[in-house]
Interface confidence: medium
């Protein structure tokens, strides 16, 4: 499921460093929806893409996102054996050459056209949450997650135990 030995050897040597420029371990094409089953959709408007969170009509086709998985080290300044804190990171691309980016200054999630190697703002730590959901934590800003705010994706800071399991940062991935 995820793992190509050559890539593993490459990523295993990394510790507290960028993973950009490295080939993904595996890729997965899926539709992205919220905990409450609203779909994440992408629309081209005035030569740029907008991201929406909306209820689809019954037979409306869901937009797909290509998730590219990478394995990296949990950034750490602790003493260790160099393999402590392996984690999965993902990039999310709804269409060729465009990736979701975290804009930490504006607390927004945007679609940017860019070439590889991708910037760190395009990488999100994947958390395997309860109820078959996932959450996406910014690589560049630990504790900040992709979430839903006013029918748009936004960056939401999770700084207390009440916040994290709130539904607005939980997402479902589906092949259909």
């Amino acid at each position: 499921a995820f793992g190509i030995s050559g890539v593993q050897k490459y990523t295993r040597a990394l510790h507290d460093s960028s993973i950009t420029g490295i080939s993904p371990i595996t890729e997965y094409l899926a539709s992205l929806s919220t905990y409450n089953d609203q779909s994440i959709t992408f629309a081209l408007e005035d030569e740029s893409y907008e991201i929406y969170v909306e209820d689809l009509k019954k037979d409306e086709k869901k937009d797909k996102v290509l998730l590219s998985y990478y394995e990296s080290q949990h950034p750490s300044n602790e003493s260790g054996d160099g393999v402590d804190g392996k984690m999965l990171m993902v990039t999310l691309s709804p269409t060729k050459d465009f990736w979701l980016h975290a804009n930490n200054k504006e607390h927004s999630v945007e679609l940017h056209k860019c070439e590889k190697p991708l910037p760190d703002q395009a990488f999100f730590v994947l958390h395997n949450m309860h109820s078959n959901c996932v959450s996406f934590e910014c690589k560049t800003d630990p504790g900040v997650f992709i979430g839903v705010k006013d029918n748009h994706l936004a960056l939401i800071k999770v700084d207390s135990s009440e916040n994290l399991c709130t539904e607005n940062i939980l997402f479902k991935l589906s092949e259909t």
Epitope: A1, A30, G80, V83, V125, N128, S161, E162, L164
Partner: antibody, heavy 122, light 111 residues
Framework: EVQLVESGGGLVQPGGSLRLSCATS????????MNWVRQAPGKGLEWVGF??????????EYSASVKGRFTISRDNSKSILYLQMNSLRAEDTAVYYC?????????????WGQGTLVTVSS | EIVLTQSPATLSLSPGERATLSCRAS??????????MNWYQQKPGQAPRLLIY???NQGSGIPARFSGSGSGTDFTLTISSLEPEDFAVYYC?????????FGGGTKVEIK
């Protein structure tokens, strides 16, 4: 270096209680889900439960066989994991291990303690 | 809960031979492109040792002779050429969902 050291095992009568400890070092304790896994003598491995990390509110999950009788807790100031076992039964006799995943709750465990033996017998 | 069935229960082989261990899940352990199936080795009196995680990834410091494959419900652990230290019990474990579950184990013994 990541270290996990269990203690607190021993002989206890059916219906009795026992508290196991898992002292940890070498990592930021609050960042990690922490698990208990047990193994009855000559038998296979059984997951007991886990306690989530700080960002997930330190909430817990248990296997059906121990739910309502066992409680997992943690002392984050001391980096110690606990397993409080009440209403013990003969079938709870096992070596109890604490285990830590690489990160988050992906659920695979490269780090294990040496185990502590709990014997429930009259 | 997801039930894992390992086969065979016992595998009698000689050093240098190839070992193929099977684990079958009662339902798929795949989720968002990852197979949440893991393999451990355990020797008497020792804690389990993670060999393979997410179906095919080697744990840290695990020799290259150990490999994992499979997806969905059927998984295989292969030891390409058995070394004397490989004779032990091997467990599969799913971590797709709580409760995490383990297979009953396969004992690899010297023929």
């Amino acid at each position: 270096e990541v270290q996990l050291v269990e203690s607190g095992g021993g002989l206890v009568q059916p219906g009795g209680s026992l508290r196991l400890s898992c002292a940890t070092s070498g990592f930021t304790f609050t960042d990690y889900y922490m698990n208990w896994v047990r193994q009855a003598p000559g038998k296979g491995l059984e997951w007991v439960g886990f306690i989530r990390n700080k960002v997930n509110g330190y909430t817990t999950e248990y296997s059906a066989s121990v739910k309502g009788r066992f409680t997992i807790s943690r002392d984050n100031s001391k980096s110690i994991l606990y397993l409080q076992m009440n209403s013990l039964r003969a079938e709870d006799t096992a070596v109890y291990y604490c285990a830590r995943p690489y990160y988050g709750n992906y659920g695979w465990f490269p780090y294990w303690g040496q185990g502590t033996l709990v014997t429930v017998s009259s | 809960e997801i039930v894992l069935t390992q086969s065979p229960a016992t595998l009698s082989l000689s050093p240098g031979e190839r070992a193929t261990l099977s684990c079958r899940a009662s339902e798929s352990v795949d989720n968002y492109g990852i197979s949440f199936m893991n393999w451990y080795q355990q020797k008497p009196g020792q804690a389990p040792r993670l060999l393979i995680y997410a179906a095919s990834n080697q744990g840290s410091g695990i020799p290259a002779r150990f490999s994992g494959s499979g997806s969905g419900t059927d998984f295989t652990l292969t030891i390409s050429s058995l070394e004397p230290e490989d004779f032990a019990v091997y467990y599969c474990q799913q971590s797709k969902e709580v409760p995490y579950t383990f297979g009953g184990g396969t004992k690899v013994e010297i023929k």
